[in-house]
Amino acid sequence: GSQHIRAEKAMVDGSWLDLAKRSKLEAQPFAHLTINATDIPSGSHKVSLSSWYHDRGWAKISNMTFSNGKLIVNQDGFYYLYANICFRHHETSGDLATEYLQLMVYVTKTSIKIPSSHTLMKGGSTKYWSGNSEFHFYSINVGGFFKLRSGEEISIEVSNPSLLDPDQDATYFGAFKVRDID
Amino acid sequence: GSQHIRAEKAMVDGSWLDLAKRSKLEAQPFAHLTINATDIPSGSHKVSLSSWYHDRGWAKISNMTFSNGKLIVNQDGFYYLYANICFRHHETSGDLATEYLQLMVYVTKTSIKIPSSHTLMKGGSTKYWSGNSEFHFYSINVGGFFKLRSGEEISIEVSNPSLLDPDQDATYFGAFKVRDID
Amino acid sequence: GSQHIRAEKAMVDGSWLDLAKRSKLEAQPFAHLTINATDIPSGSHKVSLSSWYHDRGWAKISNMTFSNGKLIVNQDGFYYLYANICFRHHETSGDLATEYLQLMVYVTKTSIKIPSSHTLMKGGSTKYWSGNSEFHFYSINVGGFFKLRSGEEISIEVSNPSLLDPDQDATYFGAFKVRDID
């Protein structure tokens, strides 16, 4: 009897180990979204970037949803959010309308239940991109740890979107779940 | 009999708890590598930085390997990768060959099976470091969430390596595993 | 008898699952602290920032302590630490004492047992904020993975604190535990 129980226990514990491993390590939501430059707005004002890749190159998503330019949370939890935004200008692109630029990123959270948008993180710099240099470049990185509820949406706003670097290694944002909410 | 089973179960569950805790929390790979400035290349072009500390000061590594200037993945998984690169110049170091600088970092992944190198993340800025100021400084930070396979290698490329700040709190890169691959 | 044992086992395993989930996913320490701008030091020198929110807006803390301007570690482990610091100046604030600025952040660790302070991460830039532009902005982001022991304290030092952006999305720092120490 005791032997039978041990064997049964080993079997159940084995499946429990699999279950625990799967539930803990594999079900954790994440996303890494890279810029889709085929549809970048013009203008120098602050705009929401709605075109992102989620399934090509470095871009990937799991247990989160990408819809209408927003990253949607499917699972309550504490997440680490990050964004890397690169701006660049080459003289061959033409003359800048102004050499004094505000190059900014805003990572925002929208709650559908209470239709409101709040900025979680911002970063950037004012730059003087003079005509003396043929090429200009600048990158922003922001990151932080936030409580997100199912249904909340993360989006990215930038100034001067026409200066965005369209490479997947340059302009991206993402999130990964770190822990549950108590 | 029932009491004996309960006691045995508690004992087995106890060891299971230890095992689960150990396997989950302690076996997760990570690395934090700090610049070894004794062997920095001299040019201003983009170069791969091959000298990093892995076992002194803040530098550490576990369940990953550092070899030939590359951080080698030993365990499949999704990892958060990051890099912080600081550049600095003091007039006592001499006159800059040009005051217009591209200060850049590229975090690259190399697959040995398919010998190819791809940039995962890039960041930086063009800077005008004029002789009017005796000291100049600039830092770049990049970070992102990537799927890495065992045997893949992470390396760091920078422009103007002779301008790197050699402090361990200034120029470093790292990775930590967040979750398994489904 | 065997049926009773199975039922008991399921019940115990169920509670074990709850316990494991709670201990693993919920007890992990974290903090996200946002600047409290009511008490920012003046001057352009390097100062320690002691006023942070821990319980309003995006600010939160769990299984860590905030005291005397320092984030105190309560649980040994490997943590990801990060900081985002924004500086800004508008001409309506008055003329800058100097147009050549060092805008810097230092993330430091203090051990009470051995009263010593060490910089874990630094970042920033020298900037020329000329009077030709009415508004200037610059953000710094740093992040890294560090071994922290119970009782150790994390604090933030910046230069030019009077230029700090007081928004909660602009100037903040934080930490979250990733794994235990072996």
């Epitope: - | 001299s42 040019g43 201003s44 072009h45 170069v47 006592t92 170091s93 001499g94 006159d95 800059l96 060959a97 040009t98 005051e99 217009y100 103007n160 002779s162 301008l163 | -």
Partner: antibody, heavy 121, light 107 residues
Framework: QVQLVESGGGVVQPGRSLRLSCAAS????????MHWVRQAPDKGLEWVAV????????YYVDSVKGRFTISRDNSQNTLYLQMNSLRAEDTAVYYC????????WGYGMDVWGQGTTVTVS | DIQMTQSPSTLSASVGDRVTITCRAS??????LAWYQQKPGKAPKLLIY???SLESGVPSRFSGSGSGTEFTLTISSLQPDDFASYYC?????????FGQGTKVEIK
């Protein structure tokens, strides 16, 4: 291996022009400043001109200012010296040389070509 | 422009001798001084940069010292391959100048 090969020297009459070339190989040409240095027969070395790695900065010895122009084509890994209004005192072996540091001036010249002879008579 | 004065112009020595060559700048150049060796019909070869740093691959018997206006090149034990001409070269404020050279010949 790291190599610099000069060409374009020859005999030329005073007042005429000549263009020297220096082909670089074995190192990342785009990462380093480049010099021209000359040596008159049985004389010492004289620095002539330098160009930064990106071509934005150029400096000359006073005696050639306004007559000589240093340039580079980073896509072709080639350095040039355009010499106009040549004089008898420009007669020398002309060497191209690589800057030891790409970022800073002042660290010396660590790689030299074999030289090309220019005779003005 | 800064003038560089090398001394002596010619130096006669034997194998195994310790040899010192001096270079003086007309005003301070901090440590921005290099030393070169040149053999007849050949291009110069960098020995020392930034006054005292030994170029990679150069024998350790060569050493440099000095800062400001006075600099020295020392060959601790002269070898047969060391008989050649030696030049100092300064850098200051976007200008480069060489000394007139020192010829080391066999005594």
């Amino acid at each position: 291996q790291v190599q610099l090969v000069e060409s374009g020297g020859g005999v030329v009459q005073p007042g005429r022009s000549l263009r020297l070339s220096c082909a670089a190989s074995g190192f990342t040409f785009t990462g380093y400043g480049m010099h021209w240095v000359r040596q008159a027969p049985d004389k010492g070395l004289e620095w002539v001109a330098v160009i930064s790695y990106d071509g934005t900065n150029k400096y000359y010895v006073d005696s050639v200012k306004g007559r000589f122009t240093i340039s580079r084509d980073n896509s072709q890994n080639t350095l040039y010296l355009q010499m106009n209004s040549l004089r008898a005192e420009d007669t020398a072996v002309y060497y191209c040389a690589k800057c030891l540091s790409g970022t800073y001036w002042g660290y010396g010249m660590d790689v030299w070509g074999q030289g090309t002879t220019v005779t003005v008579s | 422009d800064i003038q560089m004065t090398q001394s002596p112009s010619t130096l006669s020595a034997s194998v195994g001798d310790r040899v010192t060559i001096t270079c003086r700048a007309s005003r301070s150049i901090n440590s921005w001084l290099a030393w070169y060796q040149q053999k007849p019909g050949k291009a110069p070869k960098l020995l020392i940069y930034k006054a005292s740093s030994l170029e990679s691959g150069v024998p350790s018997r060569f050493s440099g010292s000095g800062s400001g206006t006075e600099f020295t090149l020392t060959i601790s034990s002269l070898q047969p391959d060391d008989f050649a001409s030696y030049y100092c070269q300064q850098y200051n404020n976007y200008s480069w100048t060489f000394g007139q050279g020192t010829k080391v010949e066999i005594k």
